[in-house]
Interface confidence: low
């Protein structure tokens, strides 16, 4: 037979079965399996004293390999004491040996569950750069456990006095944390928490999920908005990067002019979707003149995981210019809201599609979060729209009845900017037109998409209109659409109604 | 573009505790990057000190293991690292270093310089 | 811990030239490797990455290759900026770094 290193097991009576009034106590170490033989078993009996006896080896029928026990008696104060049992087998190795510790008598005791819990996938399938394991160890009779964690079965150098213990009734749970470098993570090892608790090894193992499929990283490139360029005049153009796996390197954001010029100091920001995703934006100040003169902007994205470097550019867009017809209307008292009314604001036939919207109240220009502005849609012409909806409070249209809609455009002369002011009692709304009477019933339809009537009434629904926006872009009662009559060469004639 | 700068004492005695903050901007450190101390010895010689990550987990070289601490102040986007007992071994320059996939260091502090002396 | 090892403490060069910069690791590492380097005054800067992957905004002169143990960084035309001490580091287990490359005009 060829060499083989012993099995070592502790030798214990139940306590409830040793009497309390016992002045010794014998326990032992069995070492078996083993080849050739000899075995040496010491005992580190700590303070007590103590007689030990080795019975000789055994022959294992099946096997050929030995079997002994080595039994120790201690005297004294023994019910407080651990005791070690050190089994070395020289044929195996000449520093071959097994400690175990252990104490007189063992209790009956509920084993720990052993869990580990990982946070290691994010919403997009992507892992972060340090993935944590926790391991739950739980349910356990009280009393020393020690945990390890094994990286593809090899002990790792981990700092376990971070591991914590509760007590919750008659049972103890302890719980430790293994932090790992994405690098490991991905390299497909196992990685094992390993519980050593009465003498009795619990275990539980996990390894990376699944690779998700790889996300494409899209960029976009803005132009700067007519109220930044045109009021405030100081315009800036801002690189999108969406979709980036936050793991997997920096996206590095360069920026350049078409004319070779230098171009300003850019700021970055980067923020986590819910997905799990990474997006990155870099916001570029430019120059008013350089932009209405047409200079071209280049933002050039690089991350070591994209095949090739990203091209976007901008530049003032060409073609024609039509300034916007501004239109708004109060809606009327609804039921229940008394002290709210909205406000809307349709502006059309407008060109180039790049506006601002903005609402008045006081001469003081109200944030933007206090309205909701439609991006802007193609009309059946070759303009654009856009609609705009405010809800204002009583204290505001009792203190001044006017509100102003402001639209910044490029076209409009003579400083960029056309107006108009709605009031919330009927009849002083400018640009209004809530005395015509609007029809029993209208067929909306959003962009291409036709929809169902959603007016009730008897009659046929008009031909030539449209509704500017569904429900999610009109939140909150009265839902309100607004519909233009696309007639070419009539004033358009508006209402305001509830679809 | 994230830029990191390190502050400090310059001096400190033997057997004192070293405490270095790394101030943070154009990033919030809660994000999923890690955030690394790395020193260089005269003589060039550079290692590797450990890392507070996104999620606030440290990960610490072994050979420093039982004197270093790293911790951070999110709200000023900063974070900062302690060496307890230093001896003039530690004397170097201390960088704080941004490292994306926690695999390289992209982004470095332009160091401080840390002299033990008594 | 992982040793990397740069045996050539100063390296000599002309402007122009091809030069190769050596490192090795105490064990396999896969293509676990770094490049930077570092100009007098200033921090260390990533050029190469995971062996051969060049950082980005990295010129295309600065090549990596290399897997296991044995690994090289070479630039193709030296360039008077390119005058740094380079830097080695393994990202196989936890980080070292290797002792440094001076490059320097002949």
């Known amino acids: 037979a060829s060499t083989q290193s012993p099995s070592v097991f502790p030798l214990t009576r139940c306590c409830k079965n040793i009497p309390s009034n016992a002045t010794s106590v014998t326990l032992g170490c069995l070492a078996t399996g083993y080849f050739p033989e000899p075995v040496m078993v010491t005992w580190d009996t700590g303070s007590l004293n103590g007689t030990t006896m080795t019975l000789p080896a055994t022959t294992l029928t099946l096997s050929g390999h030995y079997a002994t026990i080595s039994l120790l008696t201690v005297s004294g104060a023994w019910a407080k004491q651990m005791f070690t049992c050190r089994v070395a087998h020289t044929p195996s190795s000449t520093d071959w040996v097994d400690n175990k510790t252990f104490s007189v008598c063992s209790r009956d005791f509920t084993p720990p569950t052993v869990k580990i819990l990982q946070s290691s996938c994010d919403g997009g399938g992507h892992f972060p750069p340090t993935i944590q394991l926790l391991c739950l160890v739980s349910g356990y009779t009280p009393g020393t456990i020690n945990i390890t964690w094994l990286e593809d079965g090899q002990v790792m150098d981990v700092d376990l006095s971070t591991a914590s213990t509760t007590q919750e009734g008659e049972l103890a749970s302890t719980q430790s944390e293994l932090t790992l470098s994405q690098k490991h993570w991905l390299s497909d090892r196992t990685y094992t928490c390993q519980v050593t608790y009465q003498g009795h090894t619990f275990e539980d193992s996990t390894k990376k999920c699944a690779d998700s499929n790889p996300r494409g990283v899209s960029a976009y490139l803005s132009r700067p908005s007519p109220f930044d360029l045109f009021i405030r005049k100081s315009p800036t153009i801002t690189c999108l990067v969406v979709d980036l796996a936050p793991s997997k390197g920096t996206v590095n954001l360069t920026w350049s002019r078409a004319s070779g010029k230098p171009v300003n100091h850019s700021t970055r920001k980067e923020e986590k979707q819910r997905n799990g995703t990474l997006t990155v934006t870099s916001t570029l100040p430019v120059g008013t003149r350089d932009w209405i003169e047409g200079e071209t902007y280049q933002c050039r994205v690089t991350h070591p995981h994209l095949p090739r470097a990203l091209m976007r550019s901008t530049t003032k867009t060409s073609g024609p210019r039509a300034a916007p017809e501004v239109y708004a209307f109060a809606t009327p008292e609804w039921p229940g809201s008394r002290d709210k009314r909205t406000l809307a604001c349709l502006i059309q036939n407008f060109m180039p599609e790049d506006i601002s919207v903005q609402w008045l109240h006081n001469e003081v220009q109200l944030p933007d979060a206090r309205h909701s502005t439609t991006q802007p849609r193609k009309t059946k012409g070759s303009g654009f729209f856009v609609f705009s909806r405010l809800e204002v409070t009583r204290a505001e249209w009792e203190q001044k009845d006017e509100f102003i809609c402001r639209a910044v455009h490029e076209a409009a002369s003579p400083s960029q900017t056309v107006q108009r002011a709605v009031s919330v009692n009927p009849g002083l709304a400018g640009g209004s037109a809530q005395s015509q009477r609007a029809p029993d019933r209208v067929l909306c339809h959003s962009g291409q998409q036709q929809g169902l009537p959603r007016a009730a009434g008897g009659s046929v629904p008009h031909p030539r209109c449209h509704c500017g926006a569904g429900r999610a872009d009109w939140p909150g009662p009265p839902e309100l659409d607004v519909c233009v009559e696309e007639a070419e060469g009539e004033a358009p004639w508006t209402w305001t109604g509830l679809c | 573009d994230v830029q990191l700068l390190e502050s400090g004492p310059g001096l400190v005695k033997p057997s004192q505790s070293l405490s270095l903050t790394c101030t943070v901007t154009g990033y919030s450190i809660t994000s999923d990057y890690a955030w690394n101390w790395i020193r260089q010895f005269p003589g060039n010689k550079l290692e590797w000190m450990g890392y507070?990550?996104?999620?606030?987990?440290?990960r610490y070289n072994p050979s420093l293991k039982s004197r270093i601490s790293i911790s951070r102040d999110t709200s000023k986007n900063q974070f900062f690292l302690q060496l307890n007992s230093v001896t003039s071994e530690d004397t170097a320059t201390y960088f704080c270093?941004?490292?994306?996939?926690?695999?390289?260091?992209?982004?470095w502090g332009q160091g401080t310089t840390l002299t033990v002396s008594s | 811990d992982i040793l990397m090892t740069q045996s050539h403490k100063f390296m000599s060069t002309s402007i122009g030239d091809r030069v190769s910069i050596t490192c090795k690791a105490s064990q396999d590492v896969s293509i676990d490797v770094a490049w930077y380097h570092q100009k007098p005054g200033q921090s260390p800067k990533l050029l190469i990455y995971s062996a051969s992957f060049r950082y980005a905004g990295v010129p295309d002169r600065f090549t990596g290759s290399g897997s296991g143990t044995d690994f090289t960084l070479t630039i193709s035309s030296v360039q008077a900026e390119d005058l740094a001490v380079y830097y080695c580091q393994q990202h196989y287990s936890l980080f070292t770094f290797g002792s440094g490359t001076k490059l320097e005009i002949k």
């Open positions: 270093v941004y490292g994306s996939s926690q695999r390289f260091f992209d982004y």
């Open positions: 507070i990550s996104y999620s606030g987990s440290t």
